[in-house]
């Protein structure tokens, strides 16, 4: 439905508070280096303009598109060329090319300082002094570091952030109350950002059809009692929401997400029996709750899939009449029966089924040709099952830190050209699959593990895309979205890699390591491990373990020494020499 003024329409739908927050997020995700104060000024100007349009939709410029209004505003930033270089060229373009240009310049790994958490009293004072600015700053700092963060969900995080400070800044022990809440928000935020990044990559790199297939599979698992027509409607609406958010249309996205939550709750009888509690919550909590809701129980007496998709005489007729609808039905029927499968596995099965029908429906005897198609699924199902079993056994044997180290070695040998910080970050996250998923019973392990690995490997893909260094990574990332994990799993040691020159500086440590948190200390050690493998890719597990054990003992010893810096200097030299000898460097 057309509105005379799009900006007035969205302002009225969302309300001033959400409107301002979403515009701030949008601007911070586009201009990631701009100071906070500059963004706040731009947002205030846009908000004042929106109010004039609410008062009179026929006022000057009120009929302009949001992209035109926001793009014009961003292009007024004085330091655009100095700060962003070629991104300033976007401003010479017309819409919609200008917005596409801004999108292409979003940086998944912006050169921004790490967020350091101030003392609790300092944070509480800042919160009490100016709550509005404090919360805006949170939105700004998260949005600029995570340019694809799902904007309506970031509003939910900000609401929880505010609640944490409101409660804890008046608690007897502020730190004990606040810090665990902030840690939880940080970890959940990183996970949420990575999940959304995969959705955007799916849409932008593989297209709407790929995203819709993912959504059909996931929603069919979650809402197995819903009819195919209902699932199809939800998929269409959800695709619109994510297309908008990934495209920078945050006001439309938030508005449409609210409409979708409303529709789901009004029709929960024909969607899922698990929605009742979610639907009693306020909007932001409701939308979050629906997105995380547990799978409903499967309907009674579902017939064998073979009846419709193998034994029926009409398989090729049904396929020819509407290929994507028939494949959608196959995916829906398979997924609702298999909450125990990962979404990516279900998509591989659907792709195999599609390939078989393409071949067989052109054959002399189609039924004879596709009669055994379900037999082809067996190895596809067993491969992730076996991989998860082996890796969970390894995780239970080693614990998280050493399991991460095993993955660091494995992935550095596969793709040694990738930067050390990226290998450390990605392998640490891959290693978290153990504590996240191995505790689950068999029926929940695969959807937990393989779909999580898809999210983590997408981080590798988007970071690598910024500065491509490995043809193998590019190949695994671009050939097939659903086969990324099997592609990386299948990679062996890269025999073409020329080992990195040894640099003693890389293995020189100082007393500052002693004051680091356990996590930071682990990262230092894991960085050294990656560098070791890059110098000596043929080193055995035993050799690497011996060197890492010596390294851990060296850090422990020097951190206990009276003169720590001297210890690190002298013992460090000895350790480097011993390690070189042990590895034959």
């Amino acid at each position: 439905d057309a509105h005379k003024s799009e900006v007035a329409h969205r302002f009225k739908d969302l309300g001033e508070e959400n409107f301002k927050a979403l515009v701030l997020i949008a601007f911070a995700q586009y201009l990631q280096q701009c100071p906070f104060e500059d963004h706040v000024k731009l947002v205030n100007e846009v908000t004042e303009f929106a109010k004039t349009c609410v008062a009179d939709e026929s006022a000057e410029n009120c009929d302009k598109s949001l992209h035109t209004l926001f793009g014009d505003k961003l292009c007024t930033v004085a330091t655009l060329r100095e700060t962003y270089g070629e991104m300033a060229d976007c401003c010479a373009k017309q819409e919609p090319e200008r917005n596409e240009c801004f999108l292409q310049h979003k940086d998944d790994n912006p050169n921004l300082p790490r967020l350091v958490r101030p003392e609790v009293d300092v944070m509480c004072t800042a919160f009490h002094d100016n709550e509005e600015t404090f919360l805006k700053k949170y939105l700004y700092e998260i949005a600029r570091r995570h340019p694809y963060f799902y904007a309506p969900e970031l509003l939910f995080f900000a609401k929880r952030y505010k609640a944490a400070f409101t409660e804890c800044c008046q608690a007897a022990d502020k730190a004990a109350c606040l810090l665990p809440k902030l840690d939880e928000l940080r970890d959940e935020g990183k996970a949420s950002s990575a999940k959304q990044r995969l959705k955007c990559a799916s849409l932008q790199k593989f297209g709407e059809r790929a995203f819709k297939a993912w959504a059909v599979a996931r929603l069919s698992q979650r809402f197995p009692k819903a009819e195919f027509a209902e699932v199809s409607k939800l998929v269409t609406d959800l695709t619109k929401v994510h297309t908008e958010c990934c495209h920078g249309d945050l006001l439309e996205c938030a508005d449409d997400r609210a409409d979708l939550a409303k529709y789901i709750c009004e029709n929960q009888d024909s969607i899922s029996s698990k929605l009742k509690e979610c639907c009693e919550k306020p909007l932001l909590e409701k939308s979050h709750c629906i997105a995380e809701v547990e799978n409903d129980e499967m309907p009674a007496d579902l017939p064998s899939l073979a009846a419709d998709f193998v034994e029926s005489k009409d398989v090729c007729k049904n396929y020819a009449e509407a290929k994507d609808v028939f494949l959608g039905m196959f995916l829906y029927e398979y997924a609702r029966r298999h909450p125990d499968y990962s979404v990516v596995l279900l998509l591989r099965l659907a792709k195999t089924y599609e390939t078989t029908l393409e071949k067989c429906c052109a054959a002399a005897d189609p039924h004879e040709c596709y009669a055994k198609v379900f037999d082809e699924f067996k190895p596809l199902v067993e491969e992730p099952q076996n991989l998860i079993k082996q890796n969970c056994e390894l995780f239970e044997q080693l614990g998280e830190y050493k399991f991460q180290n095993a993955l660091l070695v494995r992935y550095t040998k596969k793709v040694p050209q990738v930067s050390t910080p990226t290998l450390v970050e990605v392998s640490r996250n891959l290693g978290k699959v153990g504590s996240k998923c191995c505790k689950h019973p068999e029926a929940k392990r695969m959807p937990c593990a393989e779909d999580y690995l898809s999210v983590v490997l997408n981080q590798l893909c988007v970071l690598h895309e910024k500065t491509p260094v490995s043809d193998r990574v590019t190949k695994c990332c671009t050939e097939s979205l659903v086969n990324r994990r099997p592609c990386f799993s299948a990679l062996e040691v890269d025999e073409t890699y020329v080992p990195k020159e040894f640099n003693a500086e890389t293995f020189t440590f100082h007393a500052d390591i002693c004051t680091l948190s356990e996590k930071e200390r682990q990262i230092k050690k894991q960085t050294a491990l990656v560098e070791l493998v890059k110098h000596k890719p043929k080193a055995t597990k035993e050799q690497l373990k011996a060197v890492m054990d010596d390294f851990a003992a060296f850090v422990e010893k020097c951190c206990k020494a009276d003169d720590k810096e001297t210890c690190f200097a002298e013992e460090g030299k000895k350790l480097v020499a011993a390690s070189q000898a042990a590895l034959g460097l």
Epitope: E227, S270, L302, E311, M329
Partner: nanobody, 118 residues
Framework: EVQLQESGGGLVEPGGSLRLSCVAS????????MSWVRQAPGKGLEWVSS????????SYADSVKGRFTMSRDNAKNTLYLQLNSLKSEDTAMYYC???????????LGQGTLVTVSS
């Protein structure tokens, strides 16, 4: 607006046969599993059978298994129920409804009455 128009009922002797039809309109017929339910005089609704979207997969209540056969023609937006070896306890108003094995009450059409009596 969703419309389901049942027909084909009538008076039949025990052991006899009938074929019920249901013509659907106002929605994308082939995107829904469909079911037949019935209501005997003075009783509640009882599920009879269901059929998948494509039409190959079916499920039947124990009381009608082996006697009733459900089918659909998506090109004609029509659902069928073939009733064989009818018994007096099959006497009921028969309704077609959207959905597989519906466990939530759904709007019912006018139905078609099957009476089995000698």
């Amino acid at each position: 607006e969703v419309q389901l128009q049942e027909s084909g009922g009538g008076l039949v002797e025990p052991g006899g046969s009938l074929r019920l039809s249901c013509v659907a309109s106002g929605f994308t017929f082939q995107h829904y599993a469909m079911s037949w339910v019935r209501q005997a005089p003075g009783k509640g609704l009882e599920w009879v059978s269901s059929i998948s979207t494509v039409g190959g997969g079916t499920s039947y209540a124990d009381s009608v298994k082996g006697r009733f056969t459900m089918s659909r023609d998506n090109a004609k937006n029509t659902l069928y129920l073939q009733l064989n070896s009818l018994k007096s306890e099959d006497t009921a108003m028969y309704y077609c409804v959207r959905g597989w094995h519906p466990d939530v009450p759904r709007p019912l059409g006018q139905g078609t009455l099957v009476t089995v009596s000698s």
